[in-house]
Amino acid sequence: ALDTNYCFSSTEKNCCVRQLYIDFRKDLGWKWIHEPKGYHANFCLGPCPYIWSLDTQYSKVLALYNQHNPGASAAPCCVPQALEPLPIVYYVGRKPKVEQLSNMIVRSCKCS
Amino acid sequence: ALDTNYCFSSTEKNCCVRQLYIDFRKDLGWKWIHEPKGYHANFCLGPCPYIWSLDTQYSKVLALYNQHNPGASAAPCCVPQALEPLPIVYYVGRKPKVEQLSNMIVRSCKCS
């Protein structure tokens, strides 16, 4: 699997999950979130050659098409597969509020 | 929706489904398929700016991150959303066999 275990410990050039830290205030303009100040969101990057973690029948076809037509702009793309939630704390007036934000952290990628 | 109805009738530069015809023999090397000779597979292409058909909470965050950090390599990617099957005919000896290949035709795209 193209997950953090594999990708973070390798120098994989093909589609893999990469490290990305997002600062809520600086990178998103979300100044009102109290905790955390930011988080390891990660992102997916790298080419999707034929047979590399292909998602559907279509992505297999497209990767094969790309192999036969190397100059074509039609190619599978490296995108998130498994996403995890992130708990945040913010204040409503003086009252702290905890919220679980779904689909915020990339754990693995796929070629789609 | 970034589907064939909208995308094929517009000059949309952002993420949209694009026309792509795949010839089984020439483009994939699949000589054994009797019918059809090829099909309109289509493909997804175009940038994914902030708010453009974003798939998950993560893709919203990443698009916003990209807006604040324009030079970053982390950005959502335009990939298939709705896929349709394709019926094919091939021969096993003299006997024709009809098969439905799932997820073969792109009908719409999303930013993931």
Epitope: W30, G93 | Y50, I51, L64
Partner: antibody, heavy 121, light 107 residues
Amino acid sequence: EVQLVQSGAEVKKPGASVKVSCKTSGYTFITYWMNWVRQAPGAGLDWMGQIFPAWGSTNYNEMFEGRVTLTADTSTSTAYMELSSLRAGDIAVYYCARGYGNYALDAMDYWGQGTLVTVSS
Amino acid sequence: DIVMTQTPPSLSVSPRETASISCRASESVDSYGNSFMHWYLQKPGQSPQLLIYLASNLESGVSDRFSGSGSGTDFTLRISRVEANDTGVYYCQQNDEDPLSFGQGTK
């Protein structure tokens, strides 16, 4: 230029619901909280609640007894306020107003033009 | 809930004079070194507009004839060299405690 453009005036029967829209432009919709404030004829301002459009988090004023529902459509940068079980006391101008950005509850720096809701049998 | 009381309820001022409006909160609206008090003007037939943010910070684009002061429970909005265009209803607002609340207005 930041703009908040609200839907037109509504006339509703008692017990019915009303849904007011607030179409935004000129800023990043998912960066700011959107508040809703109402003003009865000749009266002051009452805060109804707020929504963070990025993931739909809401905070409501208990005064509205669960009758108000706030939603947002990020694809069109539009916020919505639905008020149910309408009564004569709900006759008011309803405003959407963007939060200043430093806190969830905050000052409001941009306001819509207001939507008059009339309740009449 | 924090109740905001404005005085006077209405005020008539001659051009070029100074006007003062008071706002008293039922409990302190100070937290983390800030006073969570803001001032708005609602001109006839218009939506409210933000004048002063966090007790004393002038909102961009607002005339420097407007100034705010105070802390804790007592706050004041001053308008120097009053103009006819300043006519309207002035509201204070706190956001230190949920629910956010406004004063009843000073005309």
